[in-house]
């Protein structure tokens, strides 16, 4: 059945209630320099209205503080209002390592990111940090790596490992949840001139992730005790016509090409899904495509296999798909899939359909295919035109969280966290934010607050409190970490 009645119940006490932000551009200098200037000034208020320095007088200055960054102050204010336990944000690789290697490290950028994390911890908000967050508009690579063919060049994976190591070293004492790459399975939108470009870039992204995970596992995990994964774009697929076998096969093929493409090598076999490899090969044999998935060596399979500590999924909607044979040597045509927009469904301005039961089906599919592992939904949300009373977002959050709760309570899926996308909207972009681009709060914040404080949708008489020891432990850890490195 698609929809089942709402359930009453709660998520576990250690559930991560998060909010996701995309790339945080570091502020290059703290924006409150007035506290670091030791001079005394007299303001000529009635004359030329200028400040005149008083010679021979030196004042005590205070050391620079994280909250001198105006941007950080704004984020903290928003996060405090969200009442979340976790904040997921992405670093800007190109800002941290402008040359693409460790020859020029932007220490100020790292200080900025450290401040974001440490100030969040003071509010009881832990960070989930994404190392690399490409978007359709911006590949986000340091220029020299872009110039050297970007993700078509295997050496970009090695450069990523070096960058990841730097971030683990500089931030890993405070950060316990890491995402190496956000939605590598969506870079097919950029590396799209041919299927072989798409699959070649994807291969190097997989290797990049695996190298970073292996480095963390070997060098940093013993002391930092964190967890590392990568976030996959994971929309669910349903047959457009449930009575057509070819549509069912198309739906499963969508999941193989979209999710299993990256999940199978990392979570399971070290190699690409057999179904995907065979489908592409059969099109190749029939002269319909010249695409081919890369052949992996035994060493590459060993490198990739098992390099995830948890499963991280970005889920937004469900797609209705049908089979349509497409000629051409591109990823999109290799799949032989057409999408159907169901106009009867509640949809957002960008045509995202609100189909809550899809997330539960996705979570069950992942467990069935990849075993019983910890799963985080690392981004989930919808665009809503409303600037104040964003009712569509409230409806979306309520219904999707209901389905996640069913997966936890009924299906026994080990769901560990839900991160709503996203904290603040960007100017002239679809409105996904809980806050407007000029930091005005929307009413969905109160709704999310209520779900968080109730830990879900409890029975009327059930307590939303978690045991005191657990809360205290987390707080002690936070304080310890904050004190360890200012």
């Amino acid at each position: 059945k698609e929809s089942t009645p709402d359930v009453q119940g709660q998520f576990p006490c250690d559930f991560s209630w998060g909010v996701t932000e995309s790339v945080l551009k570091p502020e290059s200098v703290a924006s409150s320099p007035q506290f670091s200037d030791p001079h005394l000034y007299v303001w000529n208020a009635t004359g030329n209205r200028l400040l005149h320095r008083v010679e021979g007088v030196r004042l005590k200055t205070r050391p620079a503080q994280c909250t001198d960054f105006v941007n950080i102050k704004k984020q903290l204010e928003m996060l405090a209002r969200m009442k979340v336990t976790h904040y997921r944000f992405a670093l800007d690789w190109a800002s941290v390592l402008p040359t693409g290697n460790l020859s020029a490290v932007n220490r100020q950028a790292l200080r900025y990111y450290r401040c974001v994390v440490s100030e969040g911890l003071k509010l009881g908000i832990s960070a989930m940090v994404t190392l690399y967050y490409p978007t359709h508009a911006h590949l986000g690579l340091p220029e020299p790596l872009l110039h050297a063919d970007g993700w078509l060049n295997p050496s970009t994976a090695e450069a990523f490992q070096a960058y990841a190591g730097l971030c683990f070293q500089e931030l890993g004492d405070l950060v316990k949840l890491w995402i190496t790459i956000n939605e590598p399975n969506r870079l097919s939108d950029i590396y799209n001139r041919s299927g072989n470009d798409t699959y070649g870039a994807a291969h190097n992204l997989l290797v990049a992730h695996a190298l970073a995970w292996r480095l963390y596992d070997r060098q940093f995990r013993p002391s930092q005790r964190g967890a590392v994964s990568l976030s996959l774009h994971a929309d669910w697929a349903e047959p457009a016509n449930p009575y057509a076998d070819s549509h069912w096969r198309a739906a499963e093929r969508f999941l193989q090409f979209e999710i299993a493409w990256f999940a199978e090598p990392l979570f399971k076999t070290g190699d690409y899904p057999a179904a995907m490899r065979e489908y592409i090969a059969s099109k190749h044999r029939r002269g319909l495509s010249s695409s081919a998935l890369p052949r992996l060596t035994e060493a590459e399979r060993r490198l990739l296999k098992g390099t995830v500590d948890f499963c991280a999924l970005n889920h937004f909607t469900t797609r209705f798909v049908m089979h349509e044979q497409l000629a051409g040597s591109r990823y999109d045509s290799d799949r032989d899939i057409q999408f159907l927009q169901d106009i009867t469904r509640l949809s957002s301005p960008t045509r995202l359909a609100v189909i809550p039961w899809g997330v539960r089906k996705l979570l069950r599919w992942v467990r069935r295919n990849y075993g019983d592992m910890d799963i985080y939904i690392t981004a989930s949300g919808i665009d809503d035109q409303a600037l104040e009373d964003d009712r569509l977002r409230k409806y979306y959050l309520g219904k999707y969280l209901q389905e996640v709760l069913k997966a936890y309570l009924i299906d026994k899926v080990r769901i560990k966290g839900y991160y709503a996308f996203k904290l603040a909207e960007e100017k002239s972009k679809p409105r996904f934010g809980f806050f407007t681009s000029d930091f005005k709060a929307k009413s969905s914040i109160q709704f999310y607050n209520k779900v968080i404080s109730s830990r879900g949708f409890p029975f009327e008489n059930s307590s939303s409190r978690c045991s005191q020891t657990q809360e205290n432990t987390e707080c002690t850890v936070c304080l310890f970490l904050v004190q360890k490195k200012p």
Epitope: A94, A137, H138, L139, G140, E143, L146, H147, A148, D149, G150, W151, L152, I190, Y191, R193, S194, N196, D197, G200, A201, S329
Partner: antibody, heavy 120, light 111 residues
Framework: QVQLQQSGAEVKKPGASVKVSCKAS????????INWVRQAPGQGLEWIGW????????KYNEKFKGKATITRDTSASTAYMELSSLRSEDTAVYFC?????????????WGQGTLVTVSS | DIVMTQSPDSLAVSLGERATINCRAS??????????MHWYQQKPGQPPKLLIY???YLESGVPDRFSGSGSGTDFTLTISSVQAEDVAVYYC?????????FGGGTKLEIK
């Protein structure tokens, strides 16, 4: 290492056509654009157009539409540029150069150039 | 299409002196967070050679006396201390829109 080897000099009469070749080696031919650039005697560089060998798609400078036709033979890892209805002002050195669609799109590798002389 | 205008047309500089070449685009050559502006050097009888890519990044093997700067529409190639082997014609080029026009060129000579 990456190399682009161009065909030899050509002398043609006005109204004739000429086909210049550019053989690529040292990389995957189908993954990078091949561009053609013209340089008339004592003049600057003029971009003519590019071809993506992966699927044969092309883009031309408006000025050279109808004058230049760029093709490729993937089995020979070779790109071609044919110039039709030659006139004396087409006398120039023609270069091929590789660019990367996903990268900076700069021309890091060049052929040695082919001199085409149009004279009656 | 974006038009590239280089200045000056020619430039005479003493050995060891600084040389500056300018390039102006008719509209911004920045997109997707990258600045698609490049500089080339061409010596007589040779194909051009890439010096600077993406406005300010030195191509490998190019001496670090060459540098590039600028953003949006205005760009500069600087040679901090001109050497005899730098005598050449220098071209700017943009690659923002998958069309790749060059500037008119600047001839550098030794005084």
């Amino acid at each position: 290492q990456v190399q682009l080897q161009q065909s030899g000099a050509e002398v043609k009469k006005p109204g004739a056509s000429v086909k210049v070749s550019c053989k690529a080696s040292g990389y995957t031919f189908t993954s990078y654009d091949i561009n053609w650039v013209r340089q008339a005697p004592g003049q600057g560089l003029e971009w003519i157009g590019w071809i993506y060998p992966g699927d044969g798609s092309t883009k031309y400078n408006e000025k050279f539409k109808g004058k230049a036709t760029i093709t490729r033979d993937t089995s020979a890892s070779t790109a071609y540029m044919e110039l039709s209805s030659l006139r004396s002002e087409d006398t120039a050195v023609y270069f091929c150069a590789r660019s990367d669609y996903y990268g900076s799109r700069s021309f890091a590798y060049w052929g040695q150039g082919t001199l085409v002389t149009v004279s009656s | 299409d974006i038009v590239m205008t280089q200045s000056p047309d020619s430039l005479a500089v003493s050995l060891g002196e600084r040389a500056t070449i300018n390039c102006r685009a008719s509209k911004s050559v920045s997109t997707s967070g990258y600045v698609y502006m490049h500089w080339y050097q061409q010596k007589p009888g040779q194909p051009p050679k890439l010096l600077i890519y993406l406005a300010s990044y030195l191509e490998s093997g190019v001496p670090d006396r060459f540098s590039g700067s600028g953003s949006g529409t205005d760009f500069t190639l600087t040679i901090s201390s001109v050497q005899a082997e730098d005598v050449a014609v220098y071209y700017c080029q943009h690659s923002r829109d998958l069309t790749f026009p060059f500037g008119g060129g600047t001839k550098l000579e030794i005084k």
